[in-house]
């Protein structure tokens, strides 16, 4: 390729390059392109993606002129089902641009993650999802003095207006965080979960905690005293180790479980902790995990049915948690 | 990636009317305002209008009736324009996003001078 | 015609705190004046730190706070780094337009 010439680029500003796509420097290090995607053609001029391990296959030495965008050998990724190439990209949804690179799946939001701050015409901004739309939109929460295209011209006090408790907002953001769910399962290792706007781009996010609310193999019936019929926090002898898909916890724990009844009630957490928990793995590998420590638990006829999808609300939640 | 860049001619003569084009990206004018503030050298920013997103405007009164702003929505276009320009209408003009001027653009520089 | 005044220069050390303020000719300034602090380092373009009296960017670190204090909109740096050496530009809007200061330039000692 002869870069002697001048350089001369089509246009002055570097192009916008859709999401996932590289912005690099031509073969003649003159103009910054586009980076060609895997399977495109590609020549000296249009290079491929190099952050994708993707490089110009001309074929023959003797063709340098067009070639066909290759991924160097990497391992594929699995990822929702599907096997992808190392080096190709792929939607996981509407809202994110995915690409497999050796085995790593990495994914840019398609979705702005713009903040919108407070003004004259738009004085309560809120992020909704719209119908039909993939991305949520910023809508403005109108006052009723407004007129149809913009502020108003009598002066419209902030002050005066019933607005979210402003202690409760973060950079126009109404923090909310759901209870966290019961526990997936009645004994033995579950998950509980909540969902939560608490980030950064205050961003709807589901947060997931290990629980127990007691142990499997715990005969815990034996231990309720004569004349009772519930042992609601029964005493564990000794301090355990947590089990998770052939991990076990670092540390041992005194942790409280939830008992038993023998009149058809159910004891499950009542008031709860959220504390990280490190698990480490026959490989070595340590992870950590937030795992939901137990500080009362109740008992009651509130039990969830076996066949009730809407299972009662007290069971379903998990109250005064500290984190 | 928000961004906003505006355009026009780099000298005018006094007397004649400016135009300048501000073209965003990032966001849809149908959800924001832009506002034109300039900054004569060596002075402090001056409000000169706005275009509100669903189209209404808004002029700084000492400029009003030389001042046209509006917008192609498709386009992602908005254009202001100045008539009967002046050597002390010599400035940088900018253009800056609704909600907290949190975006601007690099400015252009335009110089009146016959 | 309404006129907003701001300290034309204000000196800090690193670590310390300063407060920039925004006074309003015609009164008090309040909440439907939505104050706006906008910044300008050296040979960068300008962007905006706060809106709506004291909503910050996204990119606008905690340090930066907005406020209304004694009737002027404040724009407070709390323990300042070097890189806050900048000029500081507030804005008012008053019904149908917008007021810019005259700016303050702050400089950080070091």
């Known amino acids: 390729q002869d870069c002697s010439a001048q350089c001369q680029c089509a246009a002055e500003a570097a192009p916008h390059c859709p999401a996932g796509v590289s912005l690099v420097l031509d073969g003649c290090g003159c103009c910054r392109v586009c980076a060609k995607q895997l399977g495109e053609l590609c020549t000296e001029r249009d290079p491929c993606d190099p952050h994708k391990g993707l490089f110009c296959d001309f074929g023959s030495p003797a063709n340098r002129k067009i070639g066909v965008c290759t991924a160097k050998d990497g391992a594929p990724c699995v990822f929702g089902g599907s096997v992808y190439r190392s080096g190709e990209s792929f939607q996981s949804s509407c809202k994110y641009q995915c690409t497999c690179l050796d085995g790593a799946v990495g994914c840019v939001p398609l979705c702005s993650m713009d903040v919108r701050l407070p003004s004259p015409d738009c004085p309560f901004p809120r992020r909704v999802k719209l119908p039909g739309k993939c991305c949520e939109e910023w809508v403005c929460d109108e006052p009723k003095d407004r007129t149809a295209v913009g502020p108003a011209l009598a002066a419209y006090r902030l002050e005066d207006t019933f607005g979210p408790d402003p202690t409760m907002m973060r950079a126009n953001c109404l923090v909310q965080t759901t209870e966290w769910s019961a526990c997936s399962k009645t004994c033995g290792m579950g998950i509980s979960t909540r969902v939560t706007n608490d980030n950064t781009f205050c961003r709807l996010e589901k947060q997931s905690r290990l629980c127990m609310v007691r142990p499997c193999e715990a005969d815990l019936e034996e231990n309720i005293k004569k004349g009772k019929k519930c042992i609601r926090t029964p005493k564990i002898a000794k301090p355990v180790k947590f089990e998770l898909s052939g991990c076990t916890s670092v540390k041992t724990y005194r942790a409280k479980f939830c008992g038993v009844c023998t009149d058809g009630r159910c004891c499950t957490p009542h008031r709860t902790t959220t504390l990280p928990v490190e698990f480490k793995c026959p490989d070595g590998e340590i992870m950590k995990k937030n795992m939901m420590f137990i500080k009362t638990c109740a008992c009651h006829y509130n039990c969830p049915g076996d066949n009730d999808i809407f299972e009662s609300l007290y069971y379903r939640k998990m109250y005064g948690d500290m984190a | 990636e928000v961004t906003l860049k505006e355009s026009g001619p780099v000298l005018v003569k006094p007397t004649e009317t400016l135009t300048l084009t501000c073209t965003v990206s990032?966001?849809?004018?149908?959800?924001?305002?832009v506002h034109w503030i300039r900054q004569p050298p060596g002075k402090a920013l001056e409000w000169l209008a706005v275009i509100w997103r669903r189209g209404g405007t808004d002029y700084n009164a000492a400029f009003m009736s030389r001042l046209t702003i509006s917008k192609d929505t498709s386009k992602s276009q908005v254009v202001l324009t100045m008539t009967n320009m002046d050597p002390v209408d010599t400035a940088t003009y900018y253009c800056a996003r609704d909600g907290g001027f949190d975006y601007w653009g690099q400015g252009t520089t335009v110089t009146v001078s016959s | 015609e309404t006129v907003v005044t701001q300290e034309p220069s204000l000196t800090v050390s690193p670590g310390g705190t300063v407060t920039l303020t925004c006074r309003s000719s015609?009164?008090?300034?309040?909440?439907?004046?939505?104050a706006n602090w906008v910044q300008q380092k050296p040979g960068q373009a300008f962007r905006g730190l706060i809106g709506?009296?004291?909503n910050r960017a996204p990119w606008t670190p905690a340090r930066f706070s907005g406020s209304l204090l004694g009737g002027k909109a404040a724009l407070t740096l709390s323990g300042v780094q070097p890189e806050d050496e900048a000029e500081y530009y507030c804005a008012l809007w008053y019904s149908t337009h917008y007021v810019f200061g005259g700016g303050t330039k702050l400089t950080v000692l070091g």
């Open positions: 709506g009296t004291s």
């Open positions: 015609i009164g008090a300034v309040t909440t439907s004046n939505y």
């Open positions: 990032g966001f849809s004018l149908s959800t924001f305002g």
